[in-house]
Interface confidence: medium
């Protein structure tokens, strides 16, 4: 006899879930590892996902699925700070499954849905990590939480333009197919398909932003939350040419003969998954911090244009967004190769190491560009201070890759809410889940932007003090882990987590983090809307809510305005200089020859032969 509460009939067949305990002696119902796509095996490697075919038996959804094949970090074996991000289930290419957590209310109906997309640089990540456990959020806020696996690394993002066999972006299409599954099935679990908020962190947040941009993704969700990531910026996308170059390089590295695209893809499909993973880092054109081999590609389909161009033209979903950053976004990446940095010491950085580190952090910049970065981030009264050099490196990596791209994304989104308020053209019914319209073509825009800076360092953090509030370490507060007593958080941290879950869920329900499910507002101090002019944002920590203006505005002026222009103007200056030197050398030789001839001539008797 199956428990009716634990068995649900979906469009594709029955699934059986399990009860999971939550701290206040209650429980949630979890359905873990529901298939949403056919396994992308054999000929399906590198191809877009196909929807799962129906099944007849009751599908056992009581345990997490396999993780998608990915690089496993072995930098610090046995260290919980790195191991917490590594797959905690066996890896397989048969990994396209999703998880659903439902609060144990008598008859859940039309509950708000929150869909999590994990990060991991598009090369790693899995929905089964402890830090993504949806039970606490589902229980505390009475929302349905969903998370999915999607293909990463070459399996999700290898791209050869013009090839239907490896079109690129299939990892994003995995996510989109999971969102379609939510539209089709979540009402069976008591969720409201017209009230779906997608949220993610790092590459997961970049993915969320990509669905805001991608026209075919827009109708599949309502609102979006982006934690420490956006679709624009230096590491999130590559051109088709660069993607092709990397695919060909991967082929060479795993021993595929040079040939046409079909041969290359067939050969890559014949390789063991681990063979591809073992070589993936070697395809990068330069060694740099915060750079990843296989990432989304500007394909003209998923992305009609570059994220920057789409943002600048207002070509994005017209909806509310909540987004933010952590105080020390750069520190995690510094220990993976920046000279002088280690998790096992104070990482006091010499000036020489700092200058070398800047080069690694901005690998695409020329000498004059690097000089501009160094100028902005140096205290010239104290340039050899090793602590200041360490902190400057943290800021450079964090600002360049996370904070300033996110600030730009927020400003562009907010700017269009103002512009649309002024145009007065007809609305497209933008609050509806089915809105696929863009912000630039609706008069009474629904866009509103809420921005945060998370600056609380968890009391139980295993990473060294100097790393501060690290990239990724707000996630545990969003998912409510501090409510679990055995995890040794403080009472203040439990309160902060409850507050953040409330903000996130309020936003998912109403589009405004301040408004509770019953329409009330808890406190006088509100989280204000972020506008492109005032840039108001809140600090999220264990203290009272405090409002600030301008998110690292001076530094972001460098990354978002000055440096791109500088690099554009000086783009070919190195080549030009080399060419000029060569020409000058030739010209000097010629002039020397001419001078000798002239000297010789001038010594002659005048007109002797006339």
């Amino acid at each position: 006899q199956t428990d009716p509460e634990l068995t649900i009939m979906t469009r594709l067949g029955q699934v059986q879930g399990t009860r999971l305990p939550v701290p206040d002696r209650s429980h949630v119902i979890a359905f873990l590892g529901i298939p949403f796509a056919e396994p992308p095996l054999g000929k399906m490697r590198f191809k877009p996902p196909e929807p799962k075919k129906p099944w007849n038996d009751v599908f056992d959804a009581r345990d997490y699925p396999s993780a998608c094949y990915q690089y496993v970090d072995t930098s610090y074996p046995g260290f919980s700070g790195t191991e917490m991000w590594n797959p905690n289930r066996m890896m397989s290419e048969d990994c396209l499954y999703l998880n659903v957590w439902v609060p144990a209310t008598p008859r859940p109906h039309n509950l708000t849905v929150m869909v999590w997309i994990y990060g991991g640089g598009f090369y790693s990540g899995s929905s089964s990590l402890d830090v993504y456990d949806g039970r606490y959020l589902a229980h505390s806020e009475k929302v349905v939480v969903v998370s999915m696996n999607y293909r990463v690394s070459a399996f999700g993002f290898l791209a050869l333009n013009g090839s239907a066999e490896a079109p690129g972006n299939v990892g994003l299409l995995d996510q989109r197919l999971a969102l379609q599954w939510v539209q089709d099935n979540i009402h069976f679990f008591g969720g409201n398909p017209k009230q779906v908020t997608i949220f993610g962190e790092s590459a997961g947040a970049a993915s969320v932003g990509m669905h805001l941009l991608s026209p075919d993704s827009r109708p599949k969700f309502t609102r979006a939350i982006l934690q420490s990531g956006v679709p624009n910026g230096p590491w999130r996308t590559v051109s088709f040419d660069e993607a092709r170059r990397r695919a060909i390089k991967l082929g060479r590295l795993v021993g595929c003969p040079d040939g046409n695209d079909t041969d290359l893809i067939d050969c890559l499909r014949s390789k063991q998954p681990q063979d591809l993973i073992d070589q993936e880092w070697l395809v990068l054109p330069f060694s740099g911090l915060f750079r990843f081999s296989f990432v989304p590609v500007i394909d003209g389909v998923v992305f009609p244009d570059t994220p920057e161009a789409m943002l600048n033209s207002g070509n994005f979903k017209d909806t509310q967004i909540l987004l933010g950053v952590n105080q020390n976004e750069g520190s995690y990446f510094l220990i993976y190769g920046a000279p002088g940095f280690s998790k096992d010491n104070e990482s006091l950085i010499t000036r020489e190491d700092f200058l070398q580190g800047v080069k690694m952090s901005v690998p695409h910049a020329n000498e004059i560009g690097l000089e501009a970065v160094i100028l902005q981030y140096t205290d010239w009264m104290d340039e050899d201070n090793p602590i200041k050099n360490r902190e400057a490196m943290d800021d450079i990596v964090g600002d360049h890759n996370v904070v300033c791209p996110l600030q730009h994304f927020a400003k562009m989104y907010a700017q269009y809410s103002i512009l649309q308020g002024q145009t007065g053209t007809a609305s497209q019914g933008n609050l509806g889940w089915g809105n696929s319209g863009s912000a630039s073509n609706s008069g009474n825009s629904q866009v509103s932007v809420y921005l945060y800076m998370f600056d609380h360092r968890a009391s139980n953090l295993v990473w060294p003090e100097w790393m501060g509030v690290i990239h990724g370490y707000e996630i545990e507060f969003v998912f409510g882990l501090p409510l679990e007593k055995r995890l040794n958080y403080t009472l203040e941290e439990e309160k902060l987590s409850r507050r953040m879950m409330k903000y996130w869920a309020n936003f998912a329900r109403t589009g405004n983090p301040n408004i509770n499910v019953d329409g009330s507002i808890d406190s006088r101090r509100r989280w204000p809307v972020f506008t492109s002019t005032e840039q108001k944002h809140v600090g999220l920590n264990t203290d009272s809510l405090k409002v600030h203006k301008g998110l690292k505005s001076q530094f972001c002026a460098l990354w978002n305005r000055f440096l791109p222009r500088l690099l554009n103007v000086t783009e070919n200056i190195d080549d030009a200089e080399r060419q000029w030197k060569a020409e000058f050398h030739r010209w000097s030789s010629y002039m020397m020859h001419w001078k000798n001839q002239f000297d010789h001539y001038s010594k002659q008797e005048r007109c002797t032969n006339l």
Epitope: R457, S523, R525, N541, T542, D543, S544, V547, H548, K549
Partner: antibody, heavy 124, light 107 residues
């Protein structure tokens, strides 16, 4: 009785640094933010920044970020402010001031207790 | 930064009179406003917070009012000990800023 006792007046040379102290008594030092305020005849009162004695978290007025460094010593319930690269423009009275308790329930960042004030004179 | 414009810069009134000091802000501060009194040679003291709430121990002849961008401090039945400089301060968004002050004298 809640009190904030500040260190005595300072006469310093241009280019030098100075560190002034503020000893708290009569309340839980780690339970409240500590702020610093500058008072000069030209610019009236200016907020320099604040620090949470319990977490060490600071917020600075950008105008003072390069000038002031805030620290605390929990064991002696004392807050410190170091001012560097002093010029005549830094000559002023500096106050420490307590603001709201560190709780997620109170939302007002006014200064309910002020220190006795420290006069800093920068002169060669 | 939010600008705080206090007026008048100085005023003189007789004992028993009623005086009003105003504070205009460059943007809406949602009543996140405090008033302070600073007597000659002393540290400032909190009078009013959240625009209208009287701090502990402050005589009831002091009252605060206002919203949005316009705020005022009213002193009824002026006493000789009220001779002081008065400042407004907002705490809406960092950095917190103060008004230029109003010097109150007794005629």
């Amino acid at each position: 009785e809640v009190q904030l006792q500040q260190s005595g007046p300072e006469l310093v040379k241009p280019g030098a640094s100075v560190k002034i102290s503020c000893k708290a008594s009569g309340y839980s030092f780690t339970g409240y933010y500590m702020n610093w305020v500058k008072q000069s005849p030209e610019k009236s009162l200016e907020w320099i920044g604040e620090m949470s004695p319990s977490t060490g978290r600071t917020t600075y007025n950008q105008n003072f970020k390069a000038k002031a460094t805030l620290t605390v010593d929990q064991s002696s319930s004392t807050a410190y402010m170091q001012l560097k690269s002093l010029t005549s423009e830094d000559s002023a009275v500096y106050y420490c001031a307590r603001s709201v308790p560190l709780t997620t329930l109170i939302e007002d960042w006014y200064f309910d207790v002020w220190g006795t004030g420290t006069t800093v004179t920068v002169s060669s | 930064d939010i600008q705080m414009t206090q007026s008048p810069a100085s005023l003189s009134a007789s004992v028993g009179a009623t005086v009003t000091i105003t504070c205009r802000t460059s943007e809406n501060i949602d009543s996140y406003l405090a008033w302070y009194q600073q007597r000659q040679g002393k540290s400032p003291q909190l009078l009013v917070y959240a625009a209208t709430n009287l701090a502990d121990g402050v005589p009831s002849r002091f009252s605060g009012s206002g919203s949005g961008t316009q705020y005022s401090l009213k002193i009824n039945s002026l006493q000789s000990e009220d001779v002081a400089r008065y400042y407004c301060q907002h705490y809406s968004t960092t950095p917190w800023t103060f008004g230029g002050g109003t010097q109150l004298e007794i005629k």
